[in-house]
Amino acid sequence: SGTTNTVAAYNLTWKSTNFKTILEWEPKPVNQVYTVQISTKSGDWKSKCFYTTDTECDLTDEIVKDVKQTYLARVFSYPAGNVESTGSAGEPLYENSPEFTPYLETNLGQPTIQSFEQVGTKVNVTVEDERTLVRRNNTFLSLRDVFGKDLIYTLYYWKSSSSGKKTAKTNTNEFLIDVDKGENYCFSVQAVIPSRTVNRKSTDSPVECMGQEKGEFRE
């Protein structure tokens, strides 16, 4: 129970892609506002998104401090215009989020094929090393910097004239594949963390085909 007209938040959900992390919840507020707090298991609570009427709060700045920590958030509900009011237990109504460990759970964003280059019967396909909001020494780390060996890419490639797909894998950001001379190929890549139990794969990148701008051909 709590203050009249104030309801506790519910359906607290973490939405996270490449460590960009937003906590969402319900309901849309009617005569109430929310404040969010976030903490690690052993840390102090830090308040964010003070007295907001939004039902989401961007917590990226907090979780990127250490993506291997496990975080817990809670959403406090206050009557609009009277944020000092508390529930019957002497504190505002609040609801806890599920625990969230960014390294284990953040979704892998859709990758992009940066370039491909054909030399004879070989094609070198390069995947863009996407920048994250995780910092080290004042620079933003790429997805590869953060995940290192845990991250691989899968390449799907096929002749433009057929639908039969082949696959290749790399634990760098480059593929070197054999192709038939004189044939045009199309490519799509997917980021994968094989040892994950959830959110193992990204969506496929946009398809890029030979004979388009990104490609380069050399005899």
Epitope: D66, K68, Q69, Y103, L104, K149, N171, P194, S195
Partner: antibody, heavy 118, light 107 residues
Amino acid sequence: EVQLVQSGAEVKKPGASVKVSCKASGYSFTGYYMNWVRQAPGQGLEWMGEINPSTGGSTYNQKFKARVTMTVDQSTSTVYMELSSLRSEDTAVYYCARRELGGPFGYWGQGTTVTVSS
Amino acid sequence: SIQMTQSPSSLSASVGDRVTITCKASQSVSTGIAWYQQKPGKSPKLLIYFASNRYTGVPSRFSGSGYGTDFTFTISSLQPEDIATYYCQQDYSSPWTFGGGTKVEIK
């Protein structure tokens, strides 16, 4: 069920080589790095190196780099660790261990005792 | 390489006691610490990873905490089946290194 089954005990003479196997089952073999850790009698744990079963690429502890070779046979989901130029201080239990996401070793083989004695 | 200093090297406690083991890294390892239990003649078992996360199936009496260079492993209520040697390990920077171990015995 994840299982790592290692080859049996070995007795070797100083200067010889030993090759220990670790057969994996119950999971996607190429999705996890395999590590080798040894433990001398009454002593602690010492990391020797790891291999990527997908590519065969390996990383070794500098201490063993000149003497250790790790290989993989994808067709049988088996990794191998060969240690050459054996000396008495290599007497130990050798474990294979699967590296989990982010680094810890979640599954271990039962261990292979290697005794080096003249 | 990063050195891991574990203490004490051995301890004796009564059933039901709270047991605490510490591990100190020679440089910051962020949350890159795991704790293992090894019973005599058996392979090590992972208990804690990322400094404070319990591994699948590990009882709640086992917990870990810490950040940077100083880490603590706690058994909240010692049980007879907890007799073992416990090791910390840093998985932050290769070569991965282990503490020297703490042998836990029942009084």
